[in-house]
């Protein structure tokens, strides 16, 4: 069971300092941006991190949304990352959900975060280069020190 708590506005970056944004095709991508680029591209660079209470504590449970024309929420259905046009629900009556990730700091580095899927144990949000694009993907990872699954989250509230 997950019960919705408070939300915060955040900018998410990979460890190469590229900024996560949602492009016109609703794809989550990373790109080099100055602070002014980041502001100019809002709200596509501003993510709503919705925190949830977890009936079996496993870290901070979050859903990640973005509000452009409508609210879209990050999903890892079938292990594929996409933004679905939906509001994060107030309650989820299950211990797993495609929109819930566990946000945890990397041990010894409170400013570096990992996001593990609640649906797929051992699968993490990751940044991966595909041709000329840096994409947000879900990746099965057994190298937990790999920088591709680490992010910084800057609160904008």
């Amino acid at each position: 069971y997950f019960g919705k708590l408070e939300s915060k506005l955040s900018i998410i970056r990979n460890l190469n300092d590229q900024v996560l944004f949602i492009d016109q095709g609703n794809r989550p991508l990373f790109e080099d941006m100055t602070d002014s680029d980041c502001r100019d591209n809002a709200p596509r660079t501003i993510f709503i991190i919705n925190m949830y209470k977890d009936s079996q504590p496993r870290g901070m449970a979050v859903a990640i949304s973005v509000k452009c024309e409508k609210i879209s929420t990050l999903s890892c259905e079938n292990r594929i990352i996409s933004f679905k046009e939906m509001n994060p629900p107030d309650n989820i009556k299950d211990t797993k959900s495609d929109i819930i990730f566990f946000q945890r700091s990397v041990p010894g580095h409170d400013n570096k975060m990992q996001f593990e899927s609640s649906s797929y144990e051992g699968y993490f949000l990751a940044c991966e280069k595909e041709r000329d694009l840096y994409k947000l993907i879900l990746k099965k990872k057994d190298e937990l020190g790999d920088r591709s699954i680490m992010f910084t989250v800057q609160n904008e509230d």
């Epitope: 504590p57 496993r58 870290g59 566990f102 945890r104 700091s105 990397v106 041990p107 010894g108 580095h109 593990e116 144990e121 051992g122 099965k140 057994d142 190298e143 937990l144 020190g145 790999d146």
Partner: antibody
Framework: QVQLVQSGAEVKKPGASVKVSCKVS????????FHWVRRRPGKGLEWMGR????????KYAERFKDRVTMTEDTSTDTAYMELSSLRSEDTAVYYC???????????????????WGQGTLVTVSS | DIQMTQSPSSVSASVGDRVTITCLAS??????LTWYQQKPGKAPKLLIY???KLQDGVPSRFSGSGSGTDFTLTISSLQPEDFATYYC?????????FGQGTKLEIK
């Protein structure tokens, strides 16, 4: 309690190949990997590589990548490690081990080698 | 590759002694470090994971500490069954690498 049972000792000639098996018995959760580690006489532990039973993807240590093949048969819950072009320096005890997630009190994951096979002595001698 | 430098390579001690073994990583491995004990003719046994978390069933005289690049395994009061070889292992990135091992012998 998971147990790993390995095949018996082998004596091989230089240039030959050896295939060691590792059978899982007991209840094992999903999301684990098989790793292979060896210990040569008078030396320390040495990581050789791993296989993911979910998709058969492998990662090998650079020094073995041209000679080692790791496979897994999900139907029999058995992992295999084949080492080719054997030389005397490959004389060692070879271990299979499971690599899976343990968690701390906040749910943070750590991979560990928890269950180990009993080891298989491979002797390479002409 | 990440190098793990373990020291000392051997140590002689008596029952009741406090023994410390160190492992130094060549780069930041966070706390993705495990410690193993191996006795002759036996498979390694997990003692500590996450640098400082005691595996179930392991006596509390064993403890681990450290983060980043410097790690320590401490046995607070040696017991006869503790004489063995100890290894650290970094699990941060492939290839996984072990320390060279520390042989703990009876003085």
């Amino acid at each position: 309690q998971v147990q790993l049972v390995q095949s018996g000792a082998e004596v091989k000639k230089p240039g030959a190949s050896v295939k060691v098996s590792c059978k899982v018995s007991g209840e094992i959760s999903t999301g684990y990997y098989f790793h292979w580690v060896r210990r040569r006489p008078g030396k320390g532990l040495e990581w050789m590589g791993r296989i993911d039973p979910e998709d058969d993807s492998t990662k090998y240590a650079e020094r073995f990548k041209d000679r080692v093949t790791m496979t897994e048969d999900t139907s029999t819950d058995t992992a295999y490690m084949e080492l080719s072009s054997l030389r005397s320096e490959d004389t060692a005890v070879y271990y299979c081990t499971t690599w899976r997630i343990y968690r701390d009190s906040s749910g943070r994951p750590f991979y560990v080698m928890d269950a180990w096979g009993q080891g298989t002595l491979v002797t390479v001698s002409s | 590759d990440i190098q793990m430098t373990q020291s000392p390579s051997s140590v002689s001690a008596s029952v009741g002694d406090r023994v410390t073994i160190t492992c130094l990583a060549s780069e930041d491995i966070y706390t993705y470090l495990t410690w193993y004990q191996q006795k002759p003719g036996k498979a390694p046994k997990l003692l500590i994971y996450g640098a400082n978390k005691l595996q179930d069933g392991v006596p509390s005289r064993f403890s681990g500490s450290g983060s980043g690049t410097d790690f320590t395994l401490t046995i607070s009061s040696l017991q006869p069954e503790d004489f063995a070889t100890y290894y650290c292992l970094q699990g941060s990135k492939f290839p996984l690498t072990f320390g060279q091992g520390t042989k703990l012998e009876i003085k």
